[in-house]
């Protein structure tokens, strides 16, 4: 079938990086600058993506592949193929409609993107809080007091449940 198709359609012989030029008797012509064809047998080349404004070029457009964009410092990619750039926030913050806001008590964000997430509730796993949580870091859970044999550890038991480091009940 492939052989038959090739005989019938000369365009099928045009490799990626070219297009089948009807104006030149269906000869395979190279994609012009700022265009590409990622598959063979194409009758047109696609226009290359332009990485402008908040986008910056990660990789140039070649004859066979589109340009790849990234975001300028202070922004990060969202969506397939970095279709959008979203403003970075500091650790301990999340992006809202009004800009970057600190994480509420009992939540944290250890990245420059994404939302604030609740601290881990150590007691749900029968554990105790080893290190208190902050806006930037989750709590660190340790073994439950019952697991500690006398003299096995010098870890001080956590303060009452209202102290930072516990998720709201």
């Amino acid at each position: 079938f492939e052989r038959t198709r090739s005989l019938q359609d000369p365009c099928s012989n045009c490799p990626a990086g070219t297009f089948c030029d009807n104006n030149r008797n269906q000869i395979c012509s190279p994609c012009p600058p700022n265009s590409f064809s990622s598959a063979g047998g194409q009758r047109t080349c696609d226009i290359c993506r332009q990485c402008k404004g908040v986008f910056r070029t990660r990789k140039e457009c070649s004859s066979t592949s589109n340009a790849e964009c990234d975001c300028t410092p202070g922004f990060h990619c969202l969506g397939a193929g970095c279709s959008m750039c979203e403003q970075d926030c500091k650790q301990g913050q999340e992006l809202t409609k009004k800009g970057c806001k600190d994480c509420c008590f009992g939540t944290f964000n250890d990245q420059k993107r994404g939302i604030c997430r609740p601290w881990t509730n150590c007691s749900l796993d029968g554990k105790s809080v080893l290190v208190n949580g902050t806006k930037e870091r989750d709590v660190v859970c340790g073994p439950s007091p019952a697991d500690l044999s006398p003299g096995a550890s010098s870890v001080t038991p956590p303060a009452p449940a209202r102290e930072p480091g516990h998720s709201p009940q």
């Epitope: 070219t18 994609c31 600058p33 140039e60 070649s62």
Partner: antibody, heavy 118, light 112 residues
Framework: EVQLVESGGGLVQPGGSLRLSCAAS????????MIWVRQAPGKGLEYIGF???????YYASSAKGRFTISRDNSKNTLYLQMNSLRAEDTAVYYC????????????WGQGTLVTVSS | DVVMTQSPSSVSASVGDRVTITCQAS??????LAWYQQKPGKAPKLLIY???TLASGVPSRFSGSGSGTDFTLTISSLQPEDFATYYC??????????????FGGGTKVEIK
């Protein structure tokens, strides 16, 4: 006038380091792919690598690890840091600007000679 | 690596001759190929890129063609200033930010 002027070449001992500079005038380097190419005496051209308009660097496999390309936008200057130099690194080093958003060099400097010898 | 094989390595020709230089890539590079001219003691000059696009200021007697692995530079009517060495160059991206932007070995066009 649109031009590139390389400097920093000279004699260096094997194992030594050298930093080449390429001063651009008439255009801003952070809007282009900026490229380093070298040519050993009497030999052909060898592509070293480039820094693109987004600030990302790419290197030929032979240059990766020993050579580092950087730029100073405020000085409109391109750099090539070369470490652990060997006799076979002796060459004329050219900086160049890419054409039309690509890494094909179209505007070239005059070149600077680096000689690695004891 | 992408290996670019240029032929012939040298050619003797006269003014007015039609000269053809070929370049073969070890793997398909689409139409990501350029041609350069270099004269002794001078920096190279870009003639053609994207296999067939004439660079700014380059005379129309220079033309490029080909795609995939096989490419050709043609000088339709050789002029005295065309005696020089010609190089092809691929653009090809590998993985881990490594590039195979490889030059061919060169073709020296000499006076017959």
């Amino acid at each position: 006038e649109v031009q590139l002027v390389e400097s920093g070449g000279g004699l260096v001992q094997p194992g030594g380091s050298l930093r080449l500079s390429c001063a651009a005038s008439g255009f801003t380097i952070n809007s282009y792919h900026m490229i380093w190419v070298r040519q050993a005496p009497g030999k052909g051209l060898e592509y070293i690598g480039f820094i693109n308009d987004g600030g990302f660097t790419y290197y030929a496999s032979s240059a990766k690890g020993r050579f580092t390309i950087s730029r100073d936008n405020s000085k409109n200057t391109l750099y090539l840091q070369m470490n652990s130099l060997r006799a076979e690194d002796t060459a004329v080093y050219y900086c160049a600007r890419g054409v039309d958003g690509t890494s094909y060099p179209d505007l070239w400097g005059q070149g600077t000679l680096v000689t690695v010898s004891s | 690596d992408v290996v670019m094989t240029q032929s012939p390595s040298s050619v003797s020709a006269s003014v007015g001759d039609r000269v053809t230089i070929t370049c073969q890539a070890s793997q398909s590079i689409g139409s990501d190929l350029a041609w350069y001219q270099q004269k002794p003691g001078k920096a190279p000059k870009l003639l053609i890129y994207r296999a067939s696009t004439l660079a700014s200021g380059v005379p129309s007697r220079f033309s490029g063609s080909g795609s995939g692995t096989d490419f050709t530079l043609t000088i339709s009517s050789l002029q005295p200033e065309d005696f020089a060495t010609y190089y092809c160059q691929s653009i090809y991206y590998g993985s881990d930010d490594v590039i195979y932007h490889t030059f061919g070995g060169g073709t020296k066009v000499e006076i017959k």
